[in-house]
């Protein structure tokens, strides 16, 4: 994130509620902290197509910290 | 049928100011942020100023801060921009555009993907020296 200040979140709006499986190529969780006081998931489209946020009360954000939780630990 | 409208370009002097409007329909305001973008010639599209209505964060590209104001009427579905202290740099077709899941990091160079954006016509706005 080039442009990344400290002090502030990386997504505004609350989020696409789904982004289609197929088309996502990294899925990146950021934690609150002191920059951002809640959690974002942040997902790396396919072909260039740049970066979403995905909304972290959706179903599918939900399932994706899940697996990532079940990964890191 | 989603639609947004703009309003509020012109020609002006540089130093001068402009107001821009955008009017919103077809769509829950609150599950989308609110912004402006910007096509000068021969430029990418670039991020200028967003507001997202759920919770009022705004965001403003470096090239406009404490020039320009973003702010959003709830009950109206519209956003408004500010543009003061206008540059003959400013000149360009703005664009009001509703979207989700927009990352700040990646406003200056937008890429627009139409699952989750939508774009009105867009309205000239030439600052002369």
């Known amino acids: 994130f080039p442009m990344f200040k400290r002090g502030r979140c990386l997504c505004i709006g609350p989020g696409v509620k789904a982004v289609k499986v197929a088309d996502i190529e990294k899925a990146s969780i950021m934690y609150p902290s002191n920059n951002c006081d809640k959690i974002e998931v942040i997902i790396t489209l396919k072909e260039n197509k740049g970066q979403r946020c995905l909304n972290p009360k959706s179903k599918q954000a939900r399932l994706i910290i899940k697996k990532v939780e079940r990964k890191n630990f | 049928e989603v639609q947004l409208v703009e309003s509020g370009g012109g020609l002006v002097q540089a130093g001068g100011s402009l107001r821009l409007s955008c009017a919103a329909s077809?769509?829950?305001?609150?599950?989308?942020?609110i912004g402006w973008f910007r096509q000068a010639p021969g430029k990418e599209r670039e991020g200028v100023s967003i507001?997202?209505?759920?919770?009022?964060?705004?965001y403003y590209a470096d090239s406009v801060k404490g020039r320009f104001t973003i702010s959003s009427d709830n009950a109206k579905n519209t956003v408004y921009l500010q543009m003061n202290s206008l540059k003959p740099e400013d000149t360009a077709v703005y664009y009001c555009?509703?979207?989700?899941?927009?990352?700040?990091?990646?406003?200056?160079?937008?890429?627009?993907?139409?699952?989750?954006?939508?774009w009105g016509q867009g309205t000239q706005v030439t600052v002369s020296s």
């Open positions: 077809g769509f829950n305001f609150d599950d989308y942020a």
């Open positions: 555009a509703a979207g989700q899941g927009w990352v700040i990091a990646t406003m200056t160079s937008f890429r627009a993907h139409r699952e989750y954006d939508y």
């Open positions: 507001i997202s209505s759920s919770d009022g964060n705004t």
